[in-house]
């Protein structure tokens, strides 16, 4: 029997299906002659009088005619009709208002498969969590990149949920971005918090230049610090040229006087002269660059009475040069625990770090490291590689500082140093790491995971394995099996359940004999190659009452592939209406080469089977 294939909702471009869809829209009153959204979109809804007389072909309708629809009337449409409407609007490139887009999105109840056919900006209003899995999310965010993110204000919940989901999808760990990452984020790159700007200035600053809205305080501080630091791509302000100033155009409002004073005076004067002739330059950017360039005399000696005797709140009011001149590095090192309690600015922290670097050029001692507090966030991976961290207390103290954030390159380096120092990932360390970073285990390579002793597996919680791929579970499953081997049936299943994505067929067969009632979510995470050899009876026993859930998953792996391997007769015994099994009278030839190429078994119909039987009979008689 033929497998059912999904019929496209609409025929190929401009087919009668679209005409009848529009006829339906008109008759439902979705496209209304008098409604106009000119204020929102710059388009005007055209009158549709007479259009209803002849069901129109979509190509004969202008975008203006499709423009106005009130949200209230969408609720009367089925999900399928809403999707058809969305596709029609996309094909005619109709610009919709935020409200219309939100309204359509709410009515698309399940994650649409045909993302490419939907209006680009509609995707902004869909929940990114619905596109989990590397392929689905990649397709989703590749489209989002091209959408106009600025339809949504920065504070809008729909916009706020996009960035974390995009970073997770593109596999960004910590705050270090590549050029490709920034490209992949599209307009969402403008929402990246300051720590990304600090870590990835080289690739991110050129992107921030063209962000439409103003940067927030956090981004501004980080951009200012990066530009003042003089790293790539712009180099030290003292070397900037007029073309650098042009390139920095969108970031000029964040520069601040210390940077401006470092730019050669002639360059600023030339740039100001030219930009004053060019009306495209906005006023705020010019007013920042006042002709005020007398460099202050270098101040190096500590003013009398300002020498710091202890690290306390009075230092908040010190200028950077005063901190540099008046705070003794040894005093700082012995009172590091106080720094954490005092609200210094980022710029002041830079000075304090610089003092510690001068005192300990070979790397900080653990007594200082343990009390770094949020100064740890100022450390680079290079700084951390010089450290020798042996105490779990120190590790915990520093992880606490980064709590609630993604794992940064600093944290990754710190953990690496710590684990290498210990020689293996013992239970206490794993306990600590997974408490702070539930996804930590899944960030390790299969090779690194092989050094995890089975005893440590007891520290692993189900959520710690959420992002593990099959290769990682292949390594972890045997360890878990060993760790939990002395538990009885039901207790064993509870513990082993989250590791089963690495289980072989024989273990699944064994579990099917133990009345475990595996839930569908666990079943869907099993290795396809481990599920395929299971019989219908084994799957029924394995799932118990959850077997009914197979129907809802029949188009998804591994259920789809498993169905293809079963005899339709056997599937029918489940009474679930599963379709796509091997019909009666067909012979399955497991031609591994053919299957490797096509991904499906080779089926021979009754004719060839009779031929094969005749040949077998003849050879027997001979």
């Amino acid at each position: 029997m033929a497998l059912p294939t999904a019929r496209p909702l609409l025929g190929s471009c401009g087919t009668p299906a679209l005409g009848s869809l529009l006829f339906l829209l008109f008759s439902l009153g979705w496209v209304q002659p008098s409604r106009t959204l000119a204020g929102e979109t710059g388009q005007e809804a055209a009158p549709l009088d007479g259009v209803l007389a002849n069901p129109p072909n979509i190509s004969s309708l202008s975008p203006r005619q499709l423009l106005g629809f009130p949200c209230a009337e969408v609720s009367g449409l089925s999900t399928e009709r809403v999707r058809e409407l969305a596709v029609a609007l996309a094909q005619k490139n109709v610009k919709l208002s935020t409200e219309q887009l939100r309204c359509l999105a709410h009515r698309l109840s399940e994650p649409p498969e045909d993302l490419d056919a939907l209006p680009l900006d509609l995707l902004l209003f869909l929940n990114p969590d619905a596109f989990s899995g590397p392929q689905a999310c990649t397709r989703f965010f590749s489209r989002i990149t091209k959408a106009n993110v600025d339809l949504l204000p920065r504070g809008a919940p729909e916009r706020q949920r996009l960035l974390p989901a995009a970073l997770a999808c593109w596999g960004v760990r910590g705050s270090l971005l590549s050029e490709a990452d920034v490209r992949a984020l599209g307009g969402l790159a403008c929402d990246l918090p300051g720590r990304f700007v600090a870590e990835s200035a080289e690739v991110l600053l050129p992107r921030l230049v063209s962000c439409p809205g103003p940067l927030d305080q956090d981004q501004q501080e980080a951009a200012r610090a990066a530009l003042q630091g003089g790293g790539p791509p712009y180099g030290p302000p003292s070397t900037w040229s007029v073309s650098t100033m042009d390139a920095l155009r969108g970031l000029l409002p964040v520069l601040g006087q210390p940077i401006i004073r470092s730019i050669p005076q002639g360059i600023v004067a030339a740039w100001r002269q030219r930009s004053s002739r060019d009306p495209s330059w906005r006023q705020p950017e010019r007013t920042i660059l006042r002709p005020r360039f007398r460099r202050e005399v270098e101040k190096t000696a500590c003013p009398s009475g300002k020498k710091a005797r202890e690290i306390d709140e009075s230092l908040i009011f010190y200028k950077k040069w005063e901190l540099e001149a008046c705070v003794d590095a040894a005093l700082l090192a012995t009172q590091m625990d106080r720094v954490n309690a005092i609200p210094f600015t980022y710029e002041q922290l830079d000075v304090l770090k610089h003092k510690l670097d001068e005192l300990y050029p070979q790397g900080y001692p653990e007594s200082v490291i343990q009390h770094l507090g949020y100064l740890f966030l100022k450390m680079s991976p290079e700084d951390i590689r010089k450290w020798n961290v042996t105490s779990l207390e120190t590790l915990k103290a520093l992880l606490e500082v980064n709590k609630g954030h993604e794992m940064s390159p600093q944290v990754a380096t710190l953990i690496d140093r710590f684990v290498k120092g210990r020689g293996q990932l013992d239970k206490d360390t794993l306990d600590t790491l997974t408490a702070f970073y539930p996804g930590y285990l899944c960030s390790l390579s299969p090779e690194e995971l092989s050094s995890v002793p089975p005893s440590s597996i007891w520290a692993v919680r189900p959520q710690d394995l959420d992002t593990c791929d099959p290769r990682q579970l292949d390594v972890l499953y045997p360890k878990a099996r060993l760790a939990f081997q002395n538990m009885n049936g039901s207790e064993y299943f509870v513990k082993i359940q989250s590791f089963l994505g690495g289980a072989p067929t024989e273990d699944l067969k064994a579990l099917s004999q133990q009345n475990v009632s595996m839930d569908l979510a666990t079943f869907m995470k099993l290795r396809t190659d481990a599920v395929l050899p299971l019989t219908v009876a084994e799957v029924q026993k394995l799932l118990g009452p959850h077997v009914e859930g197979l129907k809802a998953e029949e188009r998804h792996r591994p259920v789809r592939d498993w169905i293809l391997r079963q005899r339709q007769d056997d599937l029918d015994t489940l009474g679930l209406g599963l379709q796509g099994g091997i019909p009666n009278g067909y012979l399955v030839l497991d031609l591994s080469m053919q299957e490797a190429l096509s991904g499906t078994p080779c089926l021979l119909g009754p004719g060839p089977v009779l031929t094969v039987l005749a040949l077998l009979l003849a050879s027997t008689l001979a």
Epitope: D218, A341, P343, V401
Partner: nanobody
Framework: QVQLVESGGGTVQAGGSLKLACAAS????????MGWFRQAPGKEREGVAI????????YYRDSVKGRATISQDNAKKSVSLQMNSLRPEDTAIYYC????????????WGQGTQVTVSS
């Protein structure tokens, strides 16, 4: 969404007084320090005064000691800065700031209010 909104800025004669107010909304319950920073044209941003909201302890920069008073109204999650005997060098944009305990640099900043002292 945390918002700090400053008010009370303006132009005043040297020797005059001004009271800046900062209304906070959306601050986490755990925040424990509020304060005022300022930035004059062409100068580094600098702290003016801070107050620990839990203990009421206050700290001032040397140049405003005796002339400035920072105070809080816990019920309204607001903080004010009374500035007396104003000098031309007090001319700056004044920013309200807030922070949670041990959380790193000032996390929350207002948009700023301009104070101009004319001689």
């Amino acid at each position: 969404q945390v918002q700090l909104v400053e008010s009370g800025g303006g132009t005043v004669q040297a020797g005059g007084s001004l009271k800046l107010a900062c209304a906070a909304s959306g601050l986490p319950r755990t925040y424990n320090v509020m304060g005022w920073f300022r930035q004059a044209p062409g100068k580094e941003r600098e702290g003016v005064a801070i107050i620990y909201t839990t203990t009421g302890a206050t700290y001032y920069r040397d140049s405003v000691k005796g002339r400035a008073t920072i105070s809080q109204d816990n019920a309204k999650k607001s903080v004010s800065l009374q500035m007396n005997s104003l000098r031309p060098e007090d001319t700056a944009i004044y920013y309200c700031v807030a922070r949670q305990p041990n959380s790193g640099p000032w996390e929350y900043w207002g948009q700023g209010t301009q104070v101009t002292v004319s001689s």
